[in-house]
C-alpha cells in the first residue's frame, strides 16, 4: 500500500482466482483514543472500533472510503483504491492502445518545436468517475523538471457504436535548451483513477523524436508567364524554433491530381518556393520536416491549382 | 579551415559535410522508430557517447560570441564517433553488408574532423578508453544505439554549420 | 538486491593450483562483466581478471599464463584458477563486476572475499 | 600499465576536519568525448571488501553521505572527506578503468589525530 495523496492509498493487488489479498491497517487521523468506529462509503453498518481497523483487501467490494467516526461526528477519511497485476502484469483497463507507432502505445506525444513544449494525449471509452494526474521530468535518476497542465477533454468521437474520448496535456519543461544534444530522455507519467480502479500509464521520449512541424503557412502560387509552370512559394510557420538560419526545415512539394490515382509529382527542396507544373484540377501540397533530424513530417500545406 | 583558438572554418564546406552526415547516418539506419532502445538496456551506452550540451557554447548567441568552444566539442565528438564506427563493433561479425552506408560516414566523420582541424594544429590529444570486448549478438544493439546517438550528435553539428554558412561567413 | 560469493579452499600447496568460484545472484548477468581482484595480507589491491558479458577474457599481464577465468551461466557461477602457486599468491580474492557499457565500468558490488594461504 | 600513485600513505586529521587524498596516474583518464574521467574511489575497513564511494571521478555513488566528495582531471584526482566522522577511518583507493589492465593506488591510510 502507498499514499497516492492525502488520504488516498492505493493497495497492489496479484488479481487471480482465491487471491489471498493484501492485509491493510489503517489509522484514524485523531488524537482520540476511545469510542472511535469505522464504516465504509456511504454504509451506516460498523465495520470495526478503535482508533485502527485491520482489513484484507480482495476486490472491489474491500475498496472505497473508510471512515472513522466519534458520537456521529467524522475524524477523518481514507479512500483506498485498488492496482490490479495479472500474471506479472500491470492492468491497462482505463486507456484505449493506440497501436502507433507500435502496440501498448498508451500516451502519444508531439512538439511543434525545440522550446521544451510539448502536448500528450490518450483515448479512453470512459465517459464517468475519471480522473488524470500527470507528472514529467527530464530523466528519472536526478530528475529535470517539467511542468505539466491539467489534464482536459479535448475530443469526443463515435467510433462504431462506442464514444471515444480523447484527453489531452500540455507539458514544458522548466530550463530547456533547444540548441543542445538531449541525453536524457523526458519521462511522463499518468495517473488514471476510474471509480476505485488505479493505473498508471509511462512514457519517455527526446523531444527531438516526437518533433512535428505545423504545416507551412502563406503557401502562393505564382504563374509563370508562356508556361504551365507556377512558381510555389510558402514561408516558415510561426511555431517553429527561430532563428532559421539554425532551425532549418526541409519541404516537400506534391502536385496531386483529382483522382487518387492519379501519379503524384513530388519535389524535395529545402528552400522556401519550388517551380512545379500545375495540372487542370489539381491540387499543390507543402509539408515540413526538421532538414537535419527525421522526425514526423507536418501535416500538408493545400492549394489549388486553378 | 579552422585554426585553434583563431580564424574560422570553412563554414560552408562544413555545413555541406554535415548536411550529408546527417544523410548518412539515417540511410545507415533508417528504422530508427521502430525499435524503442530504452527497453533495452539503453542508459549505459547514452551516457558513454558525446553529447553536445547546453554550455558548449553551440546555440546560435554562443557561436556569435566564440564559435570555437563549440567547434571543439564538435571536433571531440567527431573523432570518438570515428573511433567507435572504425571498432570491431562495427568491423566485426556480424559483418555489414557490402553497400552500406557505415563505411561512407565514417570516411565523412574523419573528414569534417580534418575540415576543423587540418594538419599541423591540435586542441589536444583526443583520448578514448579501452573498448568493452563486444560479441556478435550485443554488436548489433551497440550499432543501433551508436547510429542512433550519432544522428542526434550530427543535426546539432549540421544546425551549427548551417548558421554559421548563414550568418558568420566572411 | 546483487549479491557474490566467494567459495573455494583456504589452503593450497605450493605448485599447485588454486580455484575458486564466485556465485552471483539477484541480477542478470547479461549485463554485467565480472572481475576478480585480489590483495595480500596488510597489502593493496591488484586486478587478476575479467570475464566479459559474451564470454571472453581479459587478464592482467603480469598474472597471464597462469590464470583461467571461465562461468558457468546455468549455475550464475564464475570460476578462478591459477596455477603453480607460490606463497607470493596468499591474498584475500575478491570477485567484483562491473555494468555492461561500451567501456568497462567501476566495481559497483564485491563478494565478502575468501582468504587463500599457500603454504606445504 | 598505468600507475595509480596515491598520497599520502597515510593521514591522522581530528573528528570533524577536513581530509583530503590525491591520486594522481601516469597517463590522463578523460576520454575528451564523453568528457568522462574513468576513474573511482573505495573505501576499505578491516576484515570487509572495498565499497564504492565516487565513480567518474566525482558523482558520488547513492548512499554515501554527502561528505564524501570527489573532484580533478585528467592526471590529478583528489577525494575529500568535509567533515571527518569516527566511522571512516578506513584505507582509500583509488582504480582506473580507462585501459586494461585495472591498476588501483596503493592505499592511503586514514586515522583519527
Known amino acids: 500500500i502507498w499514499e497516492l495523496k492525502k488520504d488516498v492509498y492505493v493497495v497492489e493487488l496479484d488479481w487471480y482466482p482465491d487471491a489471498p489479498g493484501e492485509m491493510v491497517v489503517l489509522t484514524c487521523d485523531t488524537p482520540e483514543e476511545d469510542g472511535i468506529t469505522w464504516t465504509l462509503d456511504q454504509s451506516s453498518e460498523v465495520l470495526g472500533s478503535g482508533k485502527t481497523l485491520t482489513i484484507q483487501v480482495k476486490e472491489f467490494g474491500d475498496a472505497g472510503q473508510y471512515t472513522c467516526h466519534k458520537g456521529g461526528e467524522v475524524l477523518s477519511h481514507s479512500l483506498l483504491l485498488l492496482h490490479k497485476k495479472e500474471d506479472g502484469i500491470w492492468s491497462t483497463d482505463i486507456l484505449k492502445d493506440q497501436k502507433e507507432p507500435k502496440n501498448k502505445t498508451f500516451l502519444r506525444c508531439e512538439a511543434k518545436n525545440y522550446s521544451g513544449r510539448f502536448t500528450c494525449w490518450w483515448l479512453t471509452t470512459i465517459s464517468t468517475d475519471l480522473t488524470f494526474s500527470v507528472k514529467s521530468s527530464r530523466g528519472s535518476s536526478d530528475p529535470q523538471g517539467v511542468t505539466c497542465g491539467a489534464a482536459t477533454l479535448s475530443a469526443e468521437r463515435v467510433r462504431g457504436d462506442n464514444k471515444e474520448y480523447e484527453y489531452s496535456v500540455e507539458c514544458q519543461e522548466d530550463s530547456a535548451c533547444p540548441a543542445a544534444e538531449e541525453s536524457l530522455p523526458i519521462e511522463v507519467m499518468v495517473d488514471a483513477v476510474h471509480k476505485l480502479k488505479y493505473e498508471n500509464y509511462t512514457s519517455s521520449f527526446f523531444i527531438r523524436d516526437i518533433i512535428k512541424p505545423d504545416p507551412p503557412k502563406n503557401l502562393q502560387l505564382k504563374p509563370l508567364k508562356n508556361s504551365r509552370q507556377v512558381e510555389v512559394s510558402w514561408e516558415y510557420p510561426d511555431t517553429w524554433s527561430t532563428p532559421h538560419s539554425y532551425f532549418s526545415l526541409t519541404f516537400c512539394v506534391q502536385v496531386q491530381g483529382k483522382s487518387k490515382r492519379e501519379k503524384k509529382d513530388r519535389v524535395f527542396t529545402d528552400k522556401t518556393s519550388a517551380t512545379v507544373i500545375c495540372r487542370k484540377n489539381a491540387s499543390i501540397s507543402v509539408r515540413a520536416q526538421d532538414r537535419y533530424y527525421s522526425s514526423s513530417w507536418s501535416e500538408w500545406a493545400s492549394v489549388p491549382c486553378s | 579551415r579552422a585554426v585553434p583558438g583563431g580564424s574560422s572554418p570553412a563554414w560552408t564546406q562544413c555545413q555541406q559535410l554535415s548536411q550529408k552526415l546527417c544523410t548518412l547516418a539515417w540511410s545507415a539506419h533508417p528504422l530508427v522508430g521502430h525499435m524503442d532502445l530504452r527497453e533495452e538496456g539503453d542508459e549505459e551506452t547514452t551516457n558513454d557517447v558525446p553529447h553536445i550540451q547546453c554550455g558548449d557554447g553551440c546555440d546560435p548567441q554562443g557561436l556569435r560570441d566564440n564559435s570555437q568552444f563549440c567547434l571543439q566539442r564538435i571536433h571531440q565528438g567527431l573523432i570518438f564517433y570515428e573511433k567507435l564506427l572504425g571498432s570491431d563493433i562495427f568491423t566485426g561479425e556480424p559483418s555489414l553488408l557490402p553497400d552500406s552506408p557505415v563505411g561512407q560516414l565514417h570516411a565523412s566523420l574523419l573528414g569534417l574532423s580534418q575540415l576543423l582541424q587540418p594538419e599541423g594544429h591540435h586542441w589536444e590529444t583526443q583520448q578514448i578508453p579501452s573498448l568493452s570486448p563486444s560479441q556478435p549478438w550485443q554488436r548489433l544493439l551497440l550499432r543501433f544505439k551508436i547510429l542512433r546517438s550519432l544522428q542526434a550528435f550530427v543535426a546539432v553539428a549540421a544546425r551549427v554549420f548551417a548558421h554559421g554558412a548563414a550568418t558568420l561567413s566572411p | 538486491q546483487v549479491q557474490l560469493q566467494e567459495s573455494g579452499p583456504g589452503l593450497v600447496k605450493p605448485s599447485e593450483t588454486l580455484s575458486l568460484t564466485c556465485t552471483v545472484s539477484g541480477g542478470s548477468l547479461s549485463s554485467y562483466n565480472v572481475h576478480w581482484i585480489r590483495q595480500p595480507p596488510g597489502k593493496g589491491l591488484e586486478w587478476i581478471g575479467v570475464i566479459w558479458t559474451g564470454g571472453s577474457t581479459d587478464y592482467n599481464p603480469s598474472l597471464k599464463s597462469r590464470v583461467t577465468i571461465s562461468r558457468d551461466t546455468s549455475k550464475n557461477q564464475f570460476s578462478l584458477k591459477l596455477s603453480s602457486v607460490t606463497a607470493a599468491d596468499t591474498a584475500v580474492y575478491y570477485c567484483?563486476?562491473?555494468?555492461?557499457?561500451?567501456?568497462?565500468?567501476?566495481?559497483?558490488?564485491w563478494g565478502q572475499g575468501t582468504l587463500v594461504t599457500v603454504s606445504s | 600499465d598505468i600507475v595509480m600513485t596515491q598520497s599520502p600513505d597515510s593521514l591522522a586529521v581530528s573528528l570533524g576536519e577536513r581530509a583530503t587524498i590525491n591520486c594522481k596516474p601516469s597517463?590522463?583518464?578523460?576520454?575528451?568525448?564523453?568528457?568522462?574521467?574513468?576513474l573511482a574511489w573505495y573505501q576499505q575497513k578491516p576484515g570487509q571488501p572495498p565499497k564504492l564511494l565516487i565513480y567518474y571521478a566525482s558523482t558520488r555513488q547513492s548512499g554515501v553521505p554527502d561528505r564524501f566528495s570527489g573532484s580533478g582531471s585528467g592526471t590529478d584526482f583528489t577525494l575529500t572527506i568535509s567533515s571527518l566522522q569516527a566511522e571512516d577511518v578506513a584505507v582509500y583507493y583509488c582504480l582506473q578503468h580507462f585501459n586494461y589492465p585495472w591498476t588501483f593506488g596503493q592505499g592511503t591510510k586514514l586515522e583519527i589525530k
Open positions: 567484483a563486476r562491473d555494468k555492461y557499457g561500451l567501456f568497462p565500468g567501476y566495481f559497483d558490488y
Open positions: 597517463q590522463s583518464l578523460l576520454s575528451s568525448g564523453n568528457r568522462k574521467n574513468y
